[in-house]
Amino acid sequence: HTAAQDNCTCPTNKMTVCSPDGPGGRCQCRALGSGMAVDCSTLTSKCLLLKARMSAPKNARTLVRPSEHALVDNDGLYDPDCDPEGRFKARQCNQTSVCWCVNSVGVRRTDKGDLSLRCDELVRTHHILIDLRHRPTAGAFNHSDLDAELRRLFRERYRLHPKFVAAVHYEQPTIQIELRQNTSQKAAGDVDIGDAAYYFERDIKGESLFQGRGGLDLRVRGEPLQVERTLIYYLDEIPPKFSMKRLTA
């Protein structure tokens, strides 16, 4: 695949180890942590990226109202179990045998239990709402220009098909990007909205996953956009199952 042949690196994932040991001496890259081969012509799955992140040395984070079933990733980082395709396994457990069910973006969608907890299927996150607040800017952003620039970003940088960017809302200083992708809509080779959202989230935090690129420079008619706060809401095809105790907390 298209890892850079000359110096054998993975353009879409710097959390890899690459060597020219593929067929015919081609460059092959493996994700840190899992050792799984990755396709450097597209985004790496969030599960493999999280696993790589946990294995890496630690350094000495008119607008839409999120649905009542929307999940926010409050649990933070964990070392996930990934299936052979690099997707999250439906059930995740930690070293103390505490288990929980996750959705396709790896966010917990049930109460925590023990090893007897069953997660019958990996429930797909089909709607992601990215809520940003930009810092004050000298020049105002035009909504249609902002919309076009964000759609261009997801298409060109994250290789997400334009049809999956459902809407861009703007009420200064809040920007909301809606990504939608049902199981039936996602064809082979399509970037998953969860992976695109994760790459975007890391870019926005100044932690780009791309090899050798500087930070993301996002401009609208030349005016730089700087982000002060990010919140991401995840909506699953099947609503999450939490106890009433958690919902009233």
Epitope: R135, P136, A138, G139, D203, I204, K205, G206, G214, G215, L216, D217, L218, R219, R221, G222, E223, P224, L225, Q226, V227
Partner: antibody, heavy 122, light 106 residues
């Protein structure tokens, strides 16, 4: 190393125009805006405007609209500023400076060109 | 336009002395940028986004402030710090600079 190289000093007649150049090297020219700043002898710094080479977007200080015109030639990584209808008030050192930015920070004007001295005299 | 007033206009300091200069904005700004200019040289960025040190700038320089009041501090004056210092705002157009603080070596 990021560098901006400006054209040499110019002595021009009142009423004429002058076109100053600023050649960029050491980075992707289209990735950051080029700003122009004026400094008259013994005076402070005055922002004229910026141009973003990737799409040609421009922003001018209202005071310099009609007085200065900003353009770029991406093929040679060069920014230009033409100053029109020159008077003694336009005698100054003109600097170009690039501004890098990411979604995290605005990195300010860095680096600056060495400046071009323009003297308007008959 | 936002007016930036720098004070003092001129000051002098001995080597090793702590130096503080201020920049006051006519209306609230979110960030301030500081530049150093020596005679015969072009301006050099020192501080971006109020408090971040630009690449290659000695750690004796620091910036702070919020709203309408900002400052640049040199923890220990060195001979090479003699220069004129300008603050600048990027909050609204036109971008404006202060008139400068000239720092001389005592």
């Amino acid at each position: 190393e990021v560098q901006l190289q400006q054209s040499g000093p110019d002595l021009v007649r009142p009423g004429a125009s002058v076109k100053l150049s600023c050649k960029a090297s050491g980075y992707t020219f289209t990735s950051s805006d080029i700003n122009w700043v004026k400094q008259r002898p013994g005076q402070g710094l005055e922002w004229i405007g910026w141009i973003y080479p990737r799409d040609g977007s421009k922003k001018y200080n209202e005071k310099f609209k009609g007085k200065a015109t900003l353009t770029v030639d991406t093929s040679s990584s060069t920014a230009y500023m033409e100053v029109h209808s020159l008077t003694s008030e336009d005698s100054a050192v003109y600097f170009c400076a690039t501004r890098f930015a990411t979604v995290v920070s605005n990195y300010g004007l860095d680096p600056w060109g060495q400046g071009t001295s323009v003297t308007v005299s008959s | 336009a936002i007016v930036l007033t720098q004070s003092p206009a001129i000051m002098s300091a001995s080597p090793g002395e702590k130096v503080t200069m201020t920049c006051s904005a006519s209306s609230s700004v979110n960030y301030i940028y500081w530049y150093q200019r020596k005679p015969g040289s072009s301006p050099r960025l020192l501080i971006y986004d109020t408090s971040n040190l630009a690449s290659g700038v000695p750690v004796r320089f620091s910036g702070s402030g919020s709203g309408t009041s900002y400052s640049l501090t040199i923890s220990r004056m060195e001979a090479e710090d003699a220069a004129t210092y300008y603050c600048q705002q990027w909050n609204s157009y036109p971008l404006t600079f202060g008139a400068g603080t000239k720092l001389e070596l005592k």
